[in-house]
């Protein structure tokens, strides 16, 4: 299903006749059909998408989303102001960075406006739902005749991330992988000059600032070896594809959250 973003004003409500929904065990009592589960992900602490499977509804229904933060200064109930749509009906909500408070309990409520009793509330720990952008600016340095060092950058969240490096040669059937902590560099001590190597990296918001399970996308791969440039054998750099929106597009020069803030929140 293609998902597009519209504001609520662009949403044409598809109303339908009220219908009786029953459970077969007791056809006289009205029993409420469960609402779909809401899944939220915080993308690089820049925005958050909370989505649901709109096609799990028995008919096209514009479900509404409200949210608040439990036991905090932000506990006022907020309406979604930026819905995501699939097949012309609501299928998610996008929250901007000013509405994201990683270290407060996020409460999200989905409701069927035609049947207000039909609602479901979930509580989420947003620091465990952060997905960083893919690592970028991968560079390779030859430290010695047989040793390579791979470096990369992550946008904004460097010290909060752990990384997974994968590499293989053209002769390998599978990747070799190595976990890397927040230092975002990796050394390969023994390199065979006759082989062509491919490296890629992905990152995860874990464990210093959160306990996220989801990895970023893989970086654009970088290659080294028999087929790489002969002009400068000691430095090979390949910028990762910037598939995702740039800092300017997000309209903010300020960093999303300072390192001190993140450490402070994590430890308190």
């Amino acid at each position: 299903l293609n998902t597009t973003i519209l504001t609520p004003n662009g949403n044409e409500d598809t109303t339908a006749d009220f219908f009786l929904t029953t459970m077969p065990t007791d056809s006289l009592s009205v029993s409420t059909l469960p609402l779909p589960e809401v899944q939220c992900f915080v993308f690089n602490v820049e925005y958050m998408n909370c989505t649901w499977n709109s096609s799990s509804e028995p008919q096209p229904t514009n479900l509404t989303l409200h949210y608040w933060y439990k036991n905090s200064d932000n506990d006022k109930v907020q309406k979604c102001s930026h819905y995501l749509f699939s097949e012309e009906i609501t299928s998610g909500c996008q929250l901007q960075k000013k509405e994201i408070h990683l270290y407060q309990t996020f409460v999200v409520q989905l409701q069927d406006p035609r049947e207000p009793r039909r609602q479901a509330t979930q509580m989420l720990k947003l620091q465990n739902l952060v997905i960083p952008w893919a690592p970028e600016n991968l560079t390779l340095h030859k430290l010695s005749e047989s040793q390579l060092e791979l470096n990369w950058n992550n946008r904004f969240l460097n010290h909060c991330l752990e990384h997974l490096v994968q590499y293989r040669t053209d002769w390998d059937h599978s990747w070799t992988e190595q976990s890397v902590d927040y230092r975002h560099k990796f050394s390969l001590p023994s390199v065979d000059g006759q082989k062509r190597y491919t490296f890629r990296v992905r990152s995860r918001f874990n464990p210093l600032c959160g306990s996220a399970q989801h990895w970023s996308e893989w970086s654009h791969p970088i290659h080294w070896g028999s087929n790489t440039s002969k002009e400068n054998p000691f430095l090979f750099a390949l910028e990762a594809e910037q598939k995702l929106i740039s800092e300017e597009d997000l309209g903010g020069e300020q960093k999303l959250i300072s390192e001190e803030d993140l450490h402070h929140h994590h430890h308190h």
Epitope: T14, T21, M23, S31, P34, S55, P58, Q59, P60
Partner: antibody, heavy 119, light 108 residues
Framework: QVQLVQSGAEVKKPGASVKVSCKAS????????MHWVRQAPGQGLEWMGW????????NYAKRFQGRVTMTRDTSITTAYMELIRLRSDDTAVYYC????????????WGRGTLVTVSS | EIVLTQSPGTLSLSPGERATLSCRAS???????LAWYQQKPGQAPRLLIY???SRATGIPDRFSGSGSGTDFTLTISRLEPEDFAVYYC?????????FGQGTKVEIK
Amino acid sequence: QVQLVQSGAEVKKPGASVKVSCKASGYTFTGHYMHWVRQAPGQGLEWMGWIYPHSGHTNYAKRFQGRVTMTRDTSITTAYMELIRLRSDDTAVYYCARRSGRSWYFDLWGRGTLVTVSS
Amino acid sequence: EIVLTQSPGTLSLSPGERATLSCRASQSVSSSYLAWYQQKPGQAPRLLIYGASSRATGIPDRFSGSGSGTDFTLTISRLEPEDFAVYYCQQYGSSPWTFGQGTKVEIK
């Protein structure tokens, strides 16, 4: 293969009831709403209602409420449609139809069960 | 409920000709929620078009759907012998789901 296999033809007397079965195979039975549609001889298609096999929830068209009951047995991936107090104008082919998992149209149909109501 | 009216009731054409079938709704139907089905004698309906214009899996490209609002069209660009059947439109945007009364495409 993905299919819906329906029970055989039935002949009933007015006032009796009929229970038609629809056996699903080749897909996750509980993941798709199952609808029932009927077609009187030489006539068009008429929607009767749906059951959500995952939870057992049902929704019936107004004109059938009180006469129709849709149930399912997830252990044998089978949906049932029971129609009571049969009348001669209930003579029709009854189809089960699977609702698509990503939208609301019917992407898979059973071959139909002919129910004849005659005194 | 939304009433769908199909026209013509019967269309008599020869193989190779173009068939144009109409479906008119009593109130606006989102184009995301209109489908066309083909039914041959003694068989169950078969999905042809969903979302007003998307062909279902395995449906030849001589079948196409168009339209929005209250007026929808199914076009068969060049009739093949196996296309002679009854065609139904259906709206699935709101309960109750409703079908048109059908258009029979017969050999002239």
